[in-house]
Amino acid sequence: AILGRSETQECLFFNANWERDRTNQTGVEPCYGDKDKRRHCFATWKNISGSIEIVKQGCWLDDINCYDRTDCIEKKDSPEVYFCCCEGNMCNEKFSYFPEMEVTQPTSNPVTPKPP
């Protein structure tokens, strides 16, 4: 392993759409991939009138946008669906929203998902 890099071997898995998609609803997903590729965890969620609804969590494969991120943080301003990714086992258990705004100071909106 490269010094300082968090190797991702497994991630929290969740699929709100599990019945339609015909998958598990929740569990721990082992992350596989080519030896030369990095592995990450991800989370996607929606904010419905202040209520957090998790859409999906699981493994995410070699994405430069996820490199060296130990925390799962969405930085886009008010997306329709929030997305974050990170490196490290089960790093997607918690996820946060820190919008990058040009003028105003970012506000912290940490999210700790309720167990399904």
């Epitope: 998609d21 015909r22 598990n24 995410w60 494969l61 994405d63 997306p79």
Partner: antibody, heavy 120, light 107 residues
Framework: EVQLLESGGGLVQPGGSLRLSCAAS????????MHWVRQAPGKGLEWVSS????????SYADSVKGRFTISRDNSKNTLYLQMNSLRAEDTAVYYC?????????????WGQGTLVTVSS | DIQMTQSPSSLSASVGDRVTITCRAS??????LNWYQQKPGKAPKLVIY???SRASGVPSRFSGSGSGTDFTLTISSLQPEDFATYYC?????????FGGGTKVEIK
């Protein structure tokens, strides 16, 4: 090297049956979900069916639901597609493909395809 | 079902040209967007996954961008081996759906 090799295609009459196979090698077959995708002559790609790593979950396109059955034998590293009540519109090249994660984030390896022709 | 709309359906270009293909989803698919290249008589080959990540062995002239509903595949300098049909595909939910394809032809 990852390899997927389909077989079992051929000419069949409307209402008939065929069983396609996809032999996998070069990776740990029982760790990956698998898919069937088809392509009618001169047309685009259409997803047909998927199965998770251990066969516990399966999913089908509405166009084949109730007629096609996807299955796998992890001891033989083989994926199957049982096709019954075949129609002319099922005529296509059928590809098997490997899913990269449990969420099928992408299909990273594909077989070369096998042609199914439904005609009287 | 999520509908994927690709444009253009075909284009003519010369070696060395910069080529851009767009794909629009009928609803937000975050970054669950993949691009495949297919040559006549051959199986599709993964080019870009997760909207922006190049698959193994894919040259750096291929790049992907976008998120939400609008996505782009760009070939910065078209090479002879790039003439093919390109498909986008969403994997946000089942059924997985593909765009209609863009055929890149020699001018």
């Amino acid at each position: 090297e990852v390899q997927l090799l389909e077989s079992g295609g051929g000419l069949v009459q409307p209402g008939g049956s065929l069983r396609l196979s996809c032999a996998a090698s070069g990776f740990t077959f029982d760790s990956y979900g698998m898919h069937w995708v088809r392509q009618a002559p001169g047309k685009g790609l259409e997803w047909v069916s998927s199965i998770n790593y251990n066969g516990g979950y399966t999913s089908y396109a509405d166009s084949v639901k109730g007629r096609f059955t996807i299955s796998r034998d992890n001891s033989k590293n083989t994926l199957y597609l049982q096709m019954n009540s075949l129609r002319a519109e099922d005529t296509a090249v059928y590809y098997c493909a490997r899913a990269a994660t449990w969420h099928d984030t992408h299909l990273d390896y594909w077989g070369q395809g096998t042609l199914v022709t439904v005609s009287s | 079902d999520i509908q994927m709309t690709q444009s253009p359906s075909s284009l003519s270009a010369s070696v060395g040209d910069r080529v851009t293909i767009t794909c629009r989803a009928s609803q937000s698919i975050v970054s669950y967007l993949n691009w495949y290249q297919q040559k006549p008589g051959k199986a599709p080959k993964l080019v870009i996954y997760a909207a922006t990540s190049r698959a193994s062995g894919v040259p750096s002239r291929f790049s992907g961008s976008g998120s939400g509903t609008d996505f782009t595949l760009t070939i910065s300098s078209l090479q002879p081996e790039d003439f093919a049909t390109y498909y986008c595909q969403q994997s946000y939910e089942n059924p997985l759906t593909f765009g209609g394809g863009t055929k890149v032809e020699i001018k």
